[in-house]
């Protein structure tokens, strides 16, 4: 067991040295571990086949140390791994796009609070039993078309706090499992009305606190088990453009939140959901 | 500042269920997550589970698994914690508590709720 | 239980006193310590965090520290209002869950 850490067999050979200090990945981690715990350290880098010889790995947490590089083959060997946390690592900025390949029984990946600018092309290739992603609160500025294409078993996807102004047609392709989708405190002005096509699984929908003026309802429309979304937050231009979105808002039977006019002046502040129709003209 | 508001005493037959509520006021539930823990008269506290509302996810005590249910309402700033097939031993005070941060595992419960007297008799 | 503690402890005004916590390497040798007061009658309080960290509006003469699998709470210049349940608290990854100490009840003599 290396110095700094503690280590024990039940229920799981676990590996824990958080909080030490550490400034790189220590050597001399049992082969046997199942979960390495290195959170709150200082380590900057994860070298290629840090974790190699430890086969049985199931979970793995890196958080809240200073990653600044991870290589591509940090993670290979590890077809057992399930769970894999490296958020809080604010200078990580971009991950390789074949970092997680191989990571075929990984369920939930924490990318959080990393800095990220950007998802790599087939960054989540190959990821098919992902079922929680984490990507909140990061620098992205853009959804690449089929960055998700993989994750068909996913059932929450955490987006909240980043810099995307828009969602493109693509963005959210293969996503037939997904419960929860959380967009909110982003940038998004535009929504592709085929945005959300793959998504007639979803139940929780946060739209709230971005940049929306109007959101097209065949954009919702696929939208079959949808129970909870919020809209809120957002400068919604409240003219005849709005009313297939306010038509839509009297029909759904889900908890909406209110969606409070921002134009015209004299609307300014009303909830959409309680105008009538005829409060919606001029174009 | 963070409040939490918990539903009144209950009094319930054995082999029944009970849900207690937990209003927060003062805060969103998107920053923290919530957790209960009981006490039963002159004894210790017992941690059950907990919930981070804005992941939609749940954790709970493996004593209590598969007869808790801890769930929660964001458009109400609302947990809640459901207990099944309640025998006399559950007889407690039922408290929930706001965890600073979102990781239950480096929990620190800042905020509690006044409790809830829940009394199983026949 | 899974962390001990001891059933009391007690000590006159003015005084300094200790109460320990005895977990295992899941646990305290793992994870942060925390510890909280239960004044009689009321809701139990976030006294320490992470191991030695004070909320605010706690007063400086708690204070907490770990070493290995144990830990400690310390209370200096003990005063009566300080009569309460005090608790210690960790996360234990064996168990996957929360665990609490078996509480000390502190008199104020």
């Known amino acids: 067991c290396p110095g700094a850490c503690v280590c024990y067999n039940e229920p799981k050979v676990t590996t824990s040295c958080p909080q030490q200090g550490l400034q790189a990945v220590p050597v001399g981690i049992p082969a046997a571990s199942q979960r390495i715990f290195l959170h709150g350290n200082r380590i900057s880098h994860v070298p290629a086949a840090s974790f190699r010889a430890c086969r049985n790995l199931t979970i793995l947490w890196l958080h809240s140390n200073v990653l600044a590089r991870i290589d591509a083959a940090a993670f290979t060997g590890l077809a057992l791994l399930e769970q894999l946390d490296l958020s809080d690592n604010a200078q990580l900025r971009s991950v390789d796009p074949a970092t997680f390949h191989g990571l075929g029984r990984l369920h939930t990946l924490h990318l959080d609070r990393c800095g990220l600018q950007e998802l790599g092309p087939g960054l989540f290739r190959g990821l098919a039993a992902l079922q929680y992603l984490y990507l909140q609160d990061n620098a992205l500025q853009a959804l690449p078309d089929d960055t998700f294409r993989d994750l068909g078993n996913l059932t929450h996807l955490f987006l909240h706090g980043n810099r995307i102004s828009s969602v493109p047609e693509r963005a959210f392709r293969g996503l037939h499992s997904l419960d929860r989708l959380l967009l909110h405190q982003n940038r998004v002005a535009h929504v592709h009305p085929h945005a959300f096509r793959d998504l007639g699984r979803l139940m929780t929908l946060y739209l709230f606190a971005n940049n929306l003026s109007a959101l097209p309802t065949e954009a919702l429309a696929p939208l079959r088990a949808l129970q909870y979304l919020r809209l809120n937050d957002n400068p919604w231009v409240c003219d005849c453009r709005a009313r297939p979105l306010w038509a839509w808002l009297q029909k759904f039977r889900g908890s909406s939140s209110e969606v409070p006019c921002s134009l015209p002046q004299r609307l300014a502040g009303r909830d959409l959901k309680r105008l009538a129709a005829n409060d919606l003209q001029g174009c | 500042e963070v409040q939490l508001v918990q539903s009144g005493a209950e009094v319930k037959k054995p082999g029944s269920s009970v849900k207690v509520s937990c209003k927060a006021s003062?805060?969103?539930?998107?920053?923290?997550?919530i957790t209960w823990v009981r006490q039963a008269p002159g004894q210790g506290l017992e941690w059950m589970g907990g919930?981070?509302?804005?992941?939609?996810?749940?954790n709970y005590a493996q004593k209590f698994q598969g007869r808790v249910t801890i769930t929660a309402d964001e458009s109400t700033n609302t947990a809640y914690m459901k207990l099944s097939s309640l025998r006399s031993e559950d007889t407690a005070v039922y408290y929930c508590?706001?965890?600073?941060?979102?990781?239950?595992?480096?929990?620190?419960?800042?905020?509690w709720g006044q409790g809830t007297m829940v009394t199983v008799s026949s | 239980y899974v962390l001990t503690q001891p059933p009391s402890a007690s000590g006159t005004p003015g005084q300094r006193v200790t109460i320990s916590c005895s977990g295992s390497?899941?646990?305290?040798?793992?994870?942060?310590v925390n510890w909280y007061q239960q004044l009689p009658g009321t809701a139990p309080k976030l006294l320490i965090y992470?191991?030695?960290q004070r909320p605010s509006g706690v007063p400086d003469r708690f204070s907490g520290s770990k070493s290995g699998t144990s830990a400690s709470l310390a209370i200096s210049g003990l005063q009566s209002e300080d009569e309460a349940d005090y608790y210690c608290?960790?996360?234990?990854?064996?168990?996957?869950?929360?665990?609490f100490g078996t509480g000390t009840k502190l008199t104020v003599l």
């Open positions: 508590a706001r965890v600073v941060g979102l990781r239950l595992r480096d929990a620190a419960f800042d905020a």
């Open positions: 003062g805060d969103t539930f998107s920053s923290y997550a």
């Open positions: 919930i981070i509302p804005i992941y939609g996810t749940a």
């Open positions: 390497s899941s646990n305290i040798g793992s994870n942060t």
């Open positions: 992470s191991n030695n």
């Open positions: 608290a960790a996360w234990d990854d064996s168990l996957n869950g929360y665990v």
